[in-house]
Each structure stands twice: as structure tokens, then as C-alpha cells.
């Protein structure tokens, strides 16, 4: 049995997969912040988690996915105000009783030290210093991400 949050996450990811492929992103667009091979957009308004997920989708991006502790620290270094919380793309899967990223992968328990409970309708937020489990209905800011396309030396066949 999937929760409404899980269904929303799956639906949005599937609709994103159906959209037409766009050319790779070589530079971060204006208003987006580059962090290594990603472009981040920190929201200015607040929303519950599923609305935040949907907003990123409308911007042809996704809620932030954090690969490891190092990336978490670099992201947190961009947050100047200690009091502000941001949703990321991680929520509790009731069916699998585990934290699940919106790309379908599960959280490696060593990656994030989460403060709070792992239970139904829990979603993950980050602040300048910590990672929190919050009710997904809580209205806070969020972070969208776009992946930059790595520049490779391409060999083109003769035309």
C-alpha cells in the first residue's frame, strides 16, 4: 500500500521521464546556483513537500538528491541563515519502511544523520547545520536541482 506522498512522487518522476529530452545543460541558468556538477534553486516561498516536488518538476528539475555526506556539507555551506529549513527529495516509504529518494533509491544509513522519527508522512529537510525528519505537510522552503552535463571529448562520425 503506497501513501499519497509516494504516489505523488512516482507520478511526477514518471511524467518527467516522459517529457522530451532537452539538450544537456553546460552552465547554470541565471538565478540558479552552481554547486559542483549541479545547479541549485533555493525557493523563496514555503510549501508542503509534495507541492515542492511538483514545483521542481514544473521547472524541469527535481527536488535535491544528495549523494553523500560531502555533498550535504557543501550544500549546507550555501545556506546563510541558520533558521531556514529546506525540503530535499527524500521521504519515508511506508511500504518499504525505509527512507527513499525520489529517484527510487534507498538512503544509505551512513550518508545523513537524521534528527527525528522515521514514520509515515515523514519527509526530510536540511538546515545550515542539520538534517531533520518533518511532517510532509509542514510548509517550508525547498531546493530544486538540475544536473550539469559533463563536457566530454566527442568523436563525431564523418557525415
Amino acid at each position: 500500500q503506497k501513501s499519497s506522498i509516494e504516489k505523488c512522487s512516482v507520478d511526477i518522476q514518471q511524467s518527467r521521464n516522459k517529457t522530451t529530452e532537452r539538450p544537456g545543460l553546460l552552465n547554470c541558468p541565471i538565478y540558479w546556483q552552481q554547486l559542483r556538477e549541479k545547479c541549485l534553486l533555493f525557493s523563496h516561498t514555503v510549501n508542503p513537500w509534495n507541492n515542492s516536488l511538483a514545483d521542481c518538476s514544473t521547472k524541469e528539475s527535481s527536488l535535491l538528491l544528495i549523494r553523500d555526506k560531502d555533498e550535504l556539507i557543501h550544500t549546507q555551506n550555501l545556506i546563510r541563515d541558520k533558521a531556514i529549513l529546506f525540503w530535499i527529495g527524500l521521504n519515508f516509504s511506508l511500504s518499504e519502511k525505509n527512507w527513499k529518494w525520489i529517484n527510487g533509491s534507498f538512503l544509505n544509513s551512513n550518508d545523513l544523520e537524521i534528527r527525528g522519527d522515521a514514520k509515515e508522512n515523514s519527509c526530510i529537510s536540511i538546515s545550515q547545520t542539520s538534517v531533520y525528519s518533518e511532517y510532509c505537510s509542514t510548509e517550508i522552503r525547498w531546493i530544486c536541482q538540475k544536473e550539469l552535463t559533463p563536457v566530454r571529448n566527442k568523436v563525431y562520425p564523418d557525415s
Epitope: I30, Y31, H44, R80, I84, K146
Partner: antibody
Framework: QVQLQESGPGLVKPSETLSLTCTVS????????WSWIRQPPGKGLEWIGY???????NYNPSLKSRVTISGDTSKNQFSLKLTSVTAADTAVYYC??????????WGQGTLVTVSS | DIVMTQTPLSSPVTLGQPASISCRSS???????????LSWLQQRPGQPPRLLIY???NRFSGVPDRFSGSGAGTDFTLIISRVEAEDVGVYYC????????FGGGTKVEIK
């Protein structure tokens, strides 16, 4: 209602640094982007740059080597520094709130003259 | 840079009649997030600019409904359906698909 007010010297000598401050009331600079725009007398508008509420900045490439924009959330202010000024930098300088391409609230502007 | 070209340079209009201002960009203004960041500003004599329209056609709060915006891609239009005396001033289009740039301005005056 968000209000912005520019302040700083109205006269700057050539080769010196122009420094202006924008004080924001009725809203926090801990949201949105905060821009500086200038308008030479009788001419059009030129975007100088913005500061993002997380602290990062973006500048007009033509001015990038001379511009610094910084913010102070405790005072709800953001500032512009433009180095090595010439007469071509004489303009009315405006600060504005930028809601991703919508410059929705503007200061009244302050005229800065570059002259010896 | 994206170059914004406005026409006409000057538009003398009769009170109560419509006015139309065109703005053309040197490349598409569709941002990589799918939005088109094209706005219109009004600058009355001796005043700072004032936002009228953002994202092509959205009227900013408090802007009279006689102002409307339209367009797509590289061609955009601001229409004042019935010009009033308070509409006199210079109108600028502005893009923010890349670093923001403004059109040269169109002066609206009463005949």
C-alpha cells in the same frame, strides 16, 4: 508593502570607488534576489547585478571585474561597490527586488556623479 | 548578451485610443526552467521604473487591466487598450532568460 531606499555619496572622483547601500523595509532580504540597476542621464536602463538571499551573487559581465554586491541580513541591507569609476559611470542608481525576472519593487534612485 | 529591440521609439497617441509597443529579442527567451522571463516596465517622468507585466502576460498587483502583454519566443507586445493621461512615460521591455537586459525604451506621449 516592500520599500527600498538607496543611500551614499552623490559625488565620486574618477578612479575611486562608488559605494551605495539599499535599505529594505516591509520585507526581508532573506528571500528573493536583490538587484542594482543604473540609468545614465537621459538614457536607458542597465542591470548591474544581484545578490541571492543565500549570499551568492551574479553580475553583468561587462561590469563584473569592478563590481561587488554584498548583503547584511541583520540590518536588512544590501550594498554596491563599483571600483575605478569614470565619467561613464555617472547615472541614477536604483536598487530593486528581483522575483526571478520580475523587478517588482524599486527604490527612488540616487544620482551619482563622477567628477573631479 | 541578449539584445532587446523596441519599436517604435516614440508613440504619440490620442487619449482613449489604444497603443501598442513591440519588443523583439535577439534569441529565444525561453529559460531552461521552461518559463519565459519577459517583463514590461513603465517609467513616468522623474520617477523610478514600475513593473507592469511579468512572464509575458501576468499583470503585477495594482496595475490597471488596460495593460496587457502577449507574445512568445522572440516577439512580444505590450498593449494599452485605452490610453490615459497618467500613462505618459517611457516603457521598457526586459528579459531575464540570461543576465537581464532592457530594450531601449518607447516614449508614449499624448497627441
Amino acid at each position: 508593502q516592500v520599500q527600498l531606499q538607496e543611500s551614499g555619496p552623490g559625488l565620486v572622483k574618477p578612479s575611486e570607488t562608488l559605494s551605495l547601500t539599499c535599505t529594505v523595509s516591509g520585507g526581508s532580504i532573506s528571500s528573493y534576489y536583490w538587484s542594482w540597476i543604473r540609468q545614465p542621464p537621459g538614457k536607458g536602463l542597465e542591470w548591474i547585478g544581484y545578490i541571492y538571499y543565500i549570499g551568492s551573487t551574479n553580475y553583468n559581465p561587462s561590469l563584473k571585474s569592478r563590481v561587488t554586491i554584498s548583503g547584511d541580513t541583520s540590518k536588512n541591507q544590501f550594498s554596491l561597490k563599483l571600483t575605478s569609476v569614470t565619467a561613464a559611470d555617472t547615472a541614477v542608481y536604483y536598487c530593486a527586488r528581483d522575483r526571478m525576472g520580475a523587478l517588482d519593487y524599486w527604490g527612488q534612485g540616487t544620482l551619482v556623479t563622477v567628477s573631479s | 548578451d541578449i539584445v532587446m529591440t523596441q519599436t517604435p521609439l516614440s508613440s504619440p497617441v490620442t487619449l482613449g485610443q489604444p497603443a501598442s509597443i513591440s519588443c523583439r529579442s535577439s534569441q529565444s527567451l525561453v529559460h531552461s526552467d521552461g518559463n519565459t522571463y519577459l517583463s514590461w516596465l513603465q517609467q513616468r517622468p522623474g520617477q523610478p521604473p514600475r513593473l507592469l507585466i511579468y512572464k509575458i502576460s501576468n499583470r503585477f498587483s495594482g496595475v490597471p487591466d488596460r495593460f496587457s502583454g502577449s507574445g512568445a519566443g522572440t516577439d512580444f507586445t505590450l498593449i494599452i487598450s485605452r490610453v490615459e493621461a497618467e500613462d505618459v512615460g517611457v516603457y521598457y521591455c526586459m528579459q531575464a532568460a540570461q543576465f537581464p537586459t532592457f530594450g531601449g525604451g518607447t516614449k508614449v506621449e499624448i497627441k
